[in-house]
C-alpha cells in the first residue's frame, strides 16, 4: 500500500512550496499533490500520449534552463529535494508546473542522472486547465524501489521546442549492506601468508566488516569497508566469510574455501593402447591435483624378468595429454610401468604398477657364413649358411628370405626367395649366362625381416665353362665379400 | 647384495613419537619405491604408505595419515619412519620393504615397537 | 578399499602332497597379485607377482594361477620347509592390501 507523507493540504490552484529540508520514513514516501479539495484532473495523458486542449497559436520566444525567456517566465513549482526510503518500499514524487493557456503542445519527460526514462516507467501527466493557465502535474512512482532507482530525478518540460528544467529530486534508497567485493575461493601454499579483500556499501553509510573463519569471528573491532584480512597461513582448509554491518542491519558475504595446496594424488588407470616390439604406448587417469595445476609426469618401467637385473628407466613427458609413447625396450619382454605427475608443491606417488608386455622383433643378426656355388650341371646356384644366432627377444624363426640379383650388361633384376626355418640350403636356378649374381640372406620371425647378410658374388659363365669353386661371406674383419670364380 | 637394515628395537612411553630407520644397500636408493607395513599380531600384514626417494612422492594409507610420516636421506640411502601420539595399539613390529615394482621383494628384519607407560 | 579374502586360517598337509591356498579380491585386480612366505620369527619373503611368475631362486613347485578376483597359490610336492604363513597382496590399487594369511601346518 502507498502510504503519503506530505505538507498540509492546499487546495488548487496553490501548489505546494518547498518542503523543510529532506524527506525520511521508513514507509514509503510519496509526494504527490492531494486532491482532497474536490477538484479533479480535467484530462489524463500517459507519457506516450502528451499534450493538451488546443488554444490556440501564439510564437514562443527561445527558453534556456537557467531561466525562461517566456512572457510570463515559466518554472516548475519547488518540490522536496531528497526522498530517502527503504529498499522494497514504492515511492511517488511529482513536479507541477503552471503554463499559461497561449502555449501549447506541452510534452514533460522524466529524466534520472541525465538520461531519459522511457518505456514502462510509472509516469502519469494530469492536466487542470483554468480560464488563464493549465496547471500540469508530472507524477512518477516505483514499486519495490531497489539500489539501482538511487539517483537524481528531473521533469522536464517542451513547449514549442524549448526546454524547462525542474530542480533535481533525489532518491536514497538505503538497505542492507550490498558487497561489492566479496572473498574469492584461493589455492595457498601451507603456511604462507595471503590477503581476503571484502568490500560492501550502503546507504546508509558507514559500512562495518567482521570476518569470520570456520564460523569464529576473526577480528573483535570492526573495520570500516573496504577491508582487507591477511590471514598469516593456514596448515589446513579453512571456511572465510565476512559479516557487513550498517544502520539498517547485516548482510554475510558467501563462504569461501580456502585449499591448502598439496602434493598430488597418483594417476590411475594407466592403461596399454599400442605395443611393439621396442615401444608401448600408455595413457593414464591423472589423480586430484592437489589444488595446483600438474606441471609434468614421469613414466618409471623395470623389465620383469626373474633372471635379470634389469635397471629403471624414467621418462619425463609433460603433464597433457595424459598419454606417452616408452621406446627402446627389448622386443618380447615384461615391463612394469607406473606414471607419477608432479604440481608446484611435489611429486605424486607412482600409480599402481601395470604389467605390458613387447611384441616380438625382427632378428638383429643375419645368417653366417653364407656360400654360393655354381652347380652347372644343373643350371642352378647352390646356397648354403648358418642360423643367425638371434636373442630370445627376436621370437621364433619362421624362415629366410633370399635375395639374388642377376647383372649383366647393364640389366639388372633382383629376386626374392623365401625358405622355411628348417633349411640351411637353397638352390635357385640360373636366370642368366655371362652375369653375376648377388647373393644376400635374411632371417625372419613374426617380428620382422632382420639384416641382410653380406652380398656374396658370383659369376656365371655362357654355357660350357664348367667352375665348382664356392664364394662365401668374409671371414669377419674383411672388407668386401671375396669373390671366388 | 640387496640388504634393508631397521634400527633396533623400541620401549616408548604413550603420546611420544618415534622414529624407525631403515638403511638399504646393495641396489639404487632413488631406483625403487621404500614402503612401510605393520604386522599385528604375528600375523596381519597392513600397508601404511610408500615414498619414492627419486621425487619424493608420498601416498599414505589414510588409516595412517597424521599417525605415521615417511621421509628419506639420499646421501645416506636411508628410509625412515616417524609415528607420533603412540598409544598401546601401535605396539607392534615394522617393516620397511623396497617395491620391486611388481611386489615387495625385499623387506627389513622388522622393528618391534612397545608402547607402554 | 579392496579387501583380499583368505578363507582359510589354517591348512593341513603332508610332506610330499599338493595344496592350494586360495585369496579372493573383494574387486577385480588383474593380474597384480603376490604372494609372500612368512616363517616364524623372520620378514614375509616374495614368491610370486604378476599372479604367475615365480620368483628367482623360489622352487618351481610353487606356481601361482588365477586373474580377476580369483587366485591361487599351489605348492606341489610339499616339503617340511614350506611350513609358514602364506600371504596374499594386491598392487593394482591404492591403499595396498594384504590378505590375512593362511597357515601352513604338518597334519
Known amino acids: 500500500a502507498i502510504t503519503e507523507a506530505r505538507e498540509e493540504a492546499k487546495p488548487y490552484p496553490l501548489f505546494p512550496g518547498p518542503l523543510p529540508g529532506s524527506l525520511q520514513t521508513d514507509h514509503t514516501s510519496l509526494l504527490s499533490l492531494p486532491h482532497t479539495s474536490g477538484y479533479q484532473p480535467a484530462l489524463m495523458f500517459s507519457p506516450t500520449q502528451p499534450g493538451r486542449p488546443y488554444t490556440g497559436n501564439v510564437a514562443i520566444p527561445r527558453v534556456t534552463s537557467a531561466g525562461s525567456k517566456l512572457l510570463p517566465p515559466l518554472a516548475f513549482k519547488h518540490t522536496v529535494g531528497h526522498i530517502i526510503l527503504s529498499e522494497h518500499k514504492d515511492v511517488k514524487f511529482n513536479c507541477s508546473i503552471s503554463v499559461p493557456n497561449i502555449y501549447q503542445d506541452t510534452t514533460i519527460s522524466w529524466w534520472k542522472d541525465g538520461k531519459e526514462l522511457l518505456g514502462a516507467h510509472h509516469a502519469i501527466t494530469q492536466f487542470y486547465p483554468d480560464d488563464e493557465v493549465t496547471a500540469i502535474i508530472a507524477s512518477f512512482s516505483i514499486t519495490s524501489v531497489q539500489r539501482s532507482d538511487n539517483g537524481s530525478y528531473i521533469c522536464k518540460m517542451k513547449i514549442n521546442n524549448e526546454e524547462i528544467v525542474s530542480d533535481p529530486i533525489y532518491i536514497e534508497v538505503q538497505g542492507l549492506p550490498h558487497f561489492t567485493k566479496q572473498p574469492e575461493s584461493m589455492n595457498v601454499t601451507r603456511n604462507t601468508a595471503f590477503n581476503l579483500t571484502c568490500q560492501a556499501v550502503g546507504p546508509p553509510e558507514p559500512v562495518n566488516i567482521f570476518w569470520v573463519q570456520n564460523s569464529s569471528r576473526v577480528n573483535e573491532q570492526p573495520e570500516k569497508s573496504p577491508s582487507v584480512l591477511t590471514v598469516p597461513g593456514l596448515t589446513e582448509m579453512a571456511v572465510f566469510s565476512c559479516e557487513a554491518h550498517n544502520d539498517k542491519g547485516l548482510t554475510v558475504s558467501k563462504g569461501v574455501q580456502i585449499n591448502i595446496k598439496a602434493i598430488p594424488s597418483p594417476p590411475t588407470e594407466v592403461s596399454i593402447h599400442n605395443s611393439t616390439a621396442h615401444s608401448i604406448l600408455i595413457s593414464w587417469v591423472p589423480g586430484f591435483d592437489g589444488y595446483s595445476p600438474f606441471r609434468n609426469c614421469s613414466v618409471q618401467v623395470k623389465e620383469v624378468d626373474p633372471l635379470s637385473n634389469g635397471s629403471v628407466m624414467i621418462f619425463n613427458t609433460s603433464a597433457s595429454p595424459h598419454m606417452y609413447q616408452i621406446k627402446q625396450l627389448q622386443a618380447l619382454a615384461n615391463y612394469s610401468i607406473g606414471v607419477s605427475c608432479m604440481n608446484e608443491i611435489g611429486w605424486s606417488a607412482v600409480s599402481p604398477w601395470i604389467l605390458a608386455s613387447t611384441t616380438e622383433g625382427a632378428p638383429s643378426v643375419a645368417p653366417l657364413n653364407v656360400t654360393v656355388f655354381l652347380n652347372e650341371s644343373r643350371d642352378n646356384v647352390d646356397i648354403r649358411w648358418m642360423k643367425p644366432l638371434t636373442k630370445r627377444q627376436a621370437g621364433e624363426l619362421v624362415g629366410y628370405r633370399i635375395s639374388h640379383v642377376w647383372q649383366s650388361a647393364g640389366i639388372s633384376k633382383e629376386l626374392l626367395e623365401e625358405v622355411g626355418q628348417n633349411n640351411s640350403r637353397a638352390q635357385i636356378s640360373v636366370q642368366v649366362h655371362n652375369a653375376t649374381c648377388t647373393v644376400r640372406i635374411a632371417a625372419v620371425t613374426k617380428g620382422g625381416v632382420g639384416p641382410f647378410s653380406d652380398p656374396v658374388k658370383i659369376f656365371i659363365p655362357a654355357h660350357g665353362w664348367v667352375d665348382h669353386a664356392p664364394s662365401s661371406t668374409p671371414a669377419p674383419g674383411n672388407a668386401d665379400p671375396v669373390l671366388i670364380i | 647384495e640387496v640388504q634393508l637394515q631397521q634400527s633396533g628395537p623400541e620401549l616408548v612411553k604413550p603420546g611420544a613419537s618415534v622414529k624407525i630407520s631403515c638403511k638399504t644397500s646393495g641396489y639404487t636408493f632413488t631406483e625403487y619405491i621404500m614402503h612401510w607395513v605393520k604386522q599385528s599380531h604375528g600375523k596381519s600384514l597392513e600397508w601404511i604408505g610408500g615414498i619414492n626417494p627419486n621425487n619424493l612422492g608420498i601416498i599414505y594409507n589414510q588409516k595412517f595419515k597424521g599417525k605415521a610420516t615417511l621421509t628419506v636421506d639420499k646421501s645416506s640411502s636411508t628410509a625412515y619412519m616417524e609415528l607420533r601420539s603412540l598409544t598401546s595399539e601401535d605396539s607392534e613390529v615394522y617393516y620397511c620393504?623396497?617395491?620391486?615394482?611388481?611386489?615387495?621383494?625385499?623387506w627389513g628384519q622388522g622393528t618391534t615397537l612397545k608402547v607402554s607407560s | 578399499d579392496i579387501v583380499m579374502t583368505q578363507s582359510h586360517k589354517f591348512m593341513s598337509t603332508s610332506v610330499g602332497d599338493r595344496v592350494s591356498i586360495t585369496c579372493k579380491a573383494s574387486q577385480d585386480v588383474g593380474t597384480s597379485v603376490a604372494w609372500y612366505q612368512q616363517k616364524p620369527g623372520h620378514s614375509p619373503k616374495l614368491l610370486i607377482y604378476?599372479?604367475?611368475t615365480r620368483r628367482t631362486g623360489v622352487p618351481d613347485r610353487f606356481t601361482g594361477s588365477g586373474s580377476g578376483t580369483d587366485f591361487t597359490l599351489t605348492i606341489s610336492n610339499v616339503q617340511s620347509e614350506d611350513l609358514a604363513d602364506y600371504f596374499c597382496h594386491q598392487y593394482n590399487s591404492y591403499p595396498l592390501t594384504f590378505g590375512a594369511g593362511t597357515k601352513l601346518e604338518l597334519k
Open positions: 604378476w599372479t604367475s
Open positions: 620393504a623396497r617395491d620391486g615394482y611388481f611386489g615387495f621383494d625385499y
